[in-house]
């Protein structure tokens, strides 16, 4: 123990205490007395900065007295006991309860000892993220929306994306007084490359142990992007049948495939099977441009491919087939 006369009593309390709107919170406050030090506590007092009078008093002989009896309660102080714990419980936290409070011990002979505590009134926000379905506008539009509702203080929203773009964040009063709803939009120029990709909304708030991550899968509606595959420029007479495939990317999905040639309908050796075109063996050279027309809800797009079946000697028996 410290030598006599050097130990001082100390009021211990956190500098800041968080509490949730509508909940109860305890403002902890304790008197730390060195082992050899004698002290007598006659009164505990809680007051709020900027307000005259005390909000809670516990007197050694008279017990507790509260400015708002239904909302305040000394947690541990009891008549007939040593008053070393001034912790005060507050019920039904309101926004206006946020502020600086002083916990004071009247001790003898050391005198009054106090400490200030900042009460933070928090409200835990509810977070949602949703896609904003768009078409190819050619200009920046919101493609995702992230909303943090009813936070106090306002939540902090950031976005993580490999697609480029920029956020547009706004605030509005929440449903409960003193709370804030934060809305953040992720804005970019829509393209077919963006469709199906994801962006992540990160919401940070004092009430969260760790940031909340909400992933949004983007939706961009666009007409079909069409190409034809399956031809390798080496098709010969007398080879096996071959297949051309109409490759289409679109959102929504294609509703129909239509095969034709630049000359009109398909020749007899070409048979359409949905996205595929079956080319049967031919006995004379051909030079035909095939057209695949793909339709979805937003429109139709087509691709062309010119196929030549040549006379040259088939050096391999693999035939016309490129698959």
């Amino acid at each position: 123990w410290p030598p006599p006369g050097t130990g001082d009593i100390i009021v211990q309390a956190p500098t800041q205490v968080p509490g949730f709107l509508g909940d109860s919170v305890t403002l902890p406050c304790y008197l730390q007395v060195p082992g050899m030090e004698e002290t007598h506590v006659s009164q505990l007092t809680w007051s709020r900065h900027g307000e005259s009078g005390s909000m809670a008093v516990f007197h050694q002989t008279q017990g507790p007295n509260y400015s708002e009896p239904k909302r305040l309660e000394f947690v541990a102080a009891r008549l007939g006991t040593e008053l070393r714990d001034a912790s005060l419980r507050m019920f039904g936290l309101r926004v206006e309860d946020e502020g600086n409070y002083t916990c004071l011990f009247v001790t003898f002979p050391q005198g009054s000892r106090s400490v200030d505590i900042w009460l933070r009134v928090l409200a835990k926000p509810q977070n949602t993220a949703e896609v904003q379905k768009v078409q190819l506008t050619g200009k920046p539009v919101p493609v995702a929306r992230c909303v943090s509702t009813g936070g106090r203080p306002p939540a902090h929203i950031t976005w993580h994306s490999d697609l480029g773009g920029m956020p547009n964040t706004s605030q509005a009063p929440g449903f409960l007084s003193g709370t804030v709803t934060v809305t953040s939009l992720w804005i970019l120029v829509p393209s077919s490359q963006v469709d199906g990709k994801s962006v992540t909304c990160k919401v940070e708030h004092e009430s969260f142990e760790k940031p909340q991550l909400l992933t949004v899968n983007l939706t961009v509606y666009y007409p079909p992007e069409v190409s034809i595959s399956g031809y390798d420029n080496n098709w010969y007479l007398s080879q096996n049948e071959a297949t051309l495939t109409c490759d289409a990317r679109s959102n929504p999905e294609p509703t129909g495939y239509n095969w034709s040639t630049t000359m009109g309908p398909l020749p007899p050796f070409a048979v359409a099977q949905g996205a595929q075109l079956l080319i049967r063996p031919v006995d004379k050279p051909i030079n035909t441009t095939f057209i695949c027309n793909v339709t979805n809800a937003l429109g139709a797009r087509q691709a062309e491919l010119t196929v030549q079946v040549k006379e040259g000697p088939p050096s391999e028996p693999s035939g016309m087939s490129s698959n």
Epitope: G5, T6, P34, E37, S42, Q60, F108, Q110, G111, S114
Partner: antibody, heavy 121, light 109 residues
């Protein structure tokens, strides 16, 4: 105004007990701390103990533990100090003093006029 | 056992300044010793002047001030008056008891 009025002088034989009273007026007695102090002839002042009038909580100078008892009577706003097993070196003027708060600090604010206790065979 | 030492006597001229000190045998006086100063005029009751090292009691003239001076407690009287002639006692707190100094007889001459 705040006043402490002590009982009159006492002459006691060695081994006897003495009870000195200190009547308070002019303030809320139950919220006060009262110390007892003595001054032997030709000697300095010596603190004996304090009592919190509201609850009777006490703190004694270890030198006097077991021989001294402090009490209060809140109905008459009076503090008492009883000293037992008196010896000749207990001969002294005994004072009660009320501690007052100045800002956040206590001080020996108001004193009684003193009670002379003589221990003699 | 802690011993509190004061100057046995000091003299000050009227209107002058004098500092009374209070030394502790256990080491430096600190705020934890809650230095108190009381005054006793001849034939009168004791009167409290200072509590908690430097806090004047209500009604105590501003010419009295308490402080820590080096390793001692001090009572400074600035602008001494004839009526300040008295015995002054320092009181220190040692964790569980008060200890009085021997007193300083102040003469205003």
């Amino acid at each position: 105004q705040v006043q402490l009025v002590q009982s009159g002088a006492e002459v006691k034989k060695p081994g006897a007990s003495v009870k000195v009273s200190c009547k308070a007026s002019g303030y809320t007695f139950t919220s006060s701390y009262i110390s007892w102090v003595r001054q032997a002839p030709g000697q300095g002042l010596e603190w004996i103990a304090w009592i919190y009038a509201g609850t009777g909580d006490t703190n004694y100078n270890q030198k006097f533990t077991g021989r001294v008892t402090m009490t209060t009577d809140t109905s008459t706003s009076t503090a008492y100090m009883e000293l037992r097993s008196l010896r000749s070196d207990d001969t002294a003027v005994y004072y009660c003093a009320r501690h007052g708060l100045t800002g956040r600090h206590w001080y020996f604010a108001v004193w009684g006029q003193g009670t002379t206790v003589t221990v003699s065979s | 056992q802690a011993v509190v030492t004061q100057e046995p006597s000091l003299t000050v001229s009227p209107g002058g300044t004098v500092t009374l000190t209070c030394r502790s045998s256990t080491g430096a006086v600190t705020t934890s010793n809650i230095a108190n100063w009381v005054q006793q005029k001849p034939g009168q009751a004791f009167r409290g002047l200072i509590g908690g090292t430097n806090n004047r009691g209500p009604g105590v003239p501003a010419r009295f001030s308490g402080s820590l001076l080096g390793d001692k407690a001090a009572l400074t009287l600035s602008g001494a008056q004839p009526e300040d002639e008295a015995e002054y006692y320092c009181i220190l707190w040692y964790s569980n008891k008060f200890v009085f100094g021997g007193g300083t007889k102040l003469t205003v001459l």
